[in-house]
């Protein structure tokens, strides 16, 4: 995501399943923290926003030409997962330790 | 990049080296096809976006709450190389048959 | 003036072993990716795989047929390129020329046969 | 077989111009990427073209040029000097590295 002024970070998102309908099928927890990734990716990109050359270049080609193309964007580059109790098909509570992806570990310019 | 009404793609986007300096010190190409990608990441995410369960539930909370949390982002999922030939410190021409992260092979949304 | 002398060619039994070197100078070695390419007799060219300069890793790859079984390293220190061949194949046998791309050496004849 | 696709041989007399074909038939290689060594017999290759970029030493009457999934070498005011190998190579990007095609064995006549 964009930010206006501050530069590519991660922030808390606090995600109550009953908001987005998931409570229909995860029964725990009934919220948790997503974490987004907030800010702009601004020139020079830093080296903690790991940018890829792609990335650097497109920071370049956006500071000659700012109206033609546009800036890095400031996304989760990895990821954590969550542990979740959930109903299955039939119905039967189940615990998944690890449900993938759920969760943002760091955020960077790409 | 974000985009205005199209859904996440991969657009052109021709790099001249010149444009951002880097001619300095590559030799060749003079310019390559870089690509961009562009558009918006909108609710339902296609398949052909490879949305991560951070970006699905992103959306969700987007679409709940649009002015607290933004949307995914569309970005390269996948980079190519491409072949330079650069200068050394010395001057020398010298190959770098795989350079890598150069061009955007696939976008999606994150 | 650019120059790279391949040495360590000679005959070898199969299964066997060689260590093939490229002394290198003219250019700033340390951060020149380096390729090894082969030519087997009356035959084209052939990557044989590459190694990145350390400051970008010193990452190594190898073209399919000489996976698991030749390894390239360098000496930075020495300006020295090297290929250690083991496991040695009949189908080995060819000129081997180490590279940057732009510059190649005069090339060494390995030759594997019983 | 070589997933770049070259005629096993060539030829002219003096003064004539010919040209090389190299076409592509693997979707890992882009032709972008595709460049030529020379081979003269008795000697190592060397590189004679890379995208608009001819080494110095390299006579102008070589040039290169690529089309949809092919690459073309020409050579104009063709001499007895340049009768050898002229090999095509490109980026595999599978392999993470060059890919070569069979060569072509120029011969000059007469």
């Known amino acids: 995501s964009t930010g206006a002024g501050s530069h590519c970070q991660k922030t808390s998102l606090r995600v109550n399943f009953e908001d987005i309908g998931w409570n229909s099928w995860i029964i725990a927890p009934k919220e948790y923290e997503a974490y987004e990734c907030k800010g702009g990716c601004f020139f020079p990109l830093a080296d903690d926003v790991t940018p890829t050359k792609h990335a650097i270049v497109q920071t370049l080609v956006h500071l000659k030409f700012p109206t033609k193309v546009g800036k890095a964007c400031c996304v989760p580059t990895k990821l954590s997962p969550i542990s979740i109790l959930y109903k299955d098909d039939m119905g039967v509570p189940t615990l998944k330790y690890h449900y993938e992806g759920m969760s943002v570990a760091e955020c960077g310019c790409r | 990049s974000t985009g205005a009404g199209s859904h996440c793609q991969k657009t052109s986007l021709r790099v001249n080296f010149e444009d951002i300096g880097w001619n300095s010190w590559i030799i060749a190409p003079k310019e390559y096809e870089a690509y961009e990608c562009k558009g918006g990441c909108f609710f339902p995410l296609a398949d052909d976006v490879t949305p991560t369960k951070h970006a699905i539930v992103q959306t969700l909370v987007h679409l709940k709450f649009p002015t607290k949390v933004g949307k995914a982002c569309c970005v390269p999922t996948k980079l190519s190389p491409i072949s330079i030939l650069y200068k050394d410190d010395m001057g020398v021409p010298t190959l770098k048959y795989h350079y890598e992260g150069m061009s955007v092979a696939e976008c999606g949304c994150r | 003036e650019v120059q790279l002398v391949e040495s360590g060619g000679g005959l070898v039994k199969p299964g066997g072993s060689l260590r093939l070197s490229c002394a290198a100078s003219?250019?700033?070695?340390?951060?020149?990716?380096m390729s090894w390419v082969r030519q087997a007799p009356g035959k084209g060219l052939e990557w044989v795989g590459r190694i990145k300069s350390k400051t970008e890793g010193g990452d190594t790859d190898y073209a399919a047929p000489v996976k698991g079984r030749f390894t390239i390293s360098r000496d930075d220190s020495k300006n020295t390129l090297y290929l250690q061949m083991n496991s040695l194949k009949t189908e080995d046998t060819a000129v081997y020329y180490c590279?940057?791309?732009?510059?190649w050496g005069q090339g060494t004849l390995v030759t594997v046969s019983s | 077989q070589s997933v770049l696709t070259q005629p096993p041989s060539a030829s002219g007399t003096p003064g004539q111009r010919v040209t090389i074909s190299c076409s592509v038939t693997?979707?890992?290689?882009?032709?972008?990427?595709v460049h030529w060594y020379q081979q003269l017999p008795g000697t190592a290759p060397k590189l004679l073209f890379f995208h608009d970029y001819r080494p110095s030493g390299v006579s102008d009457r070589f040039s290169g040029s690529k089309s949809g999934t092919s690459a073309s070498l020409a050579i104009v005011g063709l001499q007895s000097e340049d009768e050898g190998y002229y090999y095509c190579?490109?980026?595999?990007?599978?392999?993470?590295?060059?890919?070569f095609g069979g060569g072509t064995k120029l011969t000059v006549l007469g």
């Open positions: 190579a490109g980026l595999d990007e599978a392999m993470r590295g060059p890919v």
């Open positions: 590279t940057t791309g732009t510059y």
């Open positions: 003219g250019f700033t070695f340390s951060n020149a990716w």
């Open positions: 693997n979707t890992d290689i882009d032709i972008f990427n």
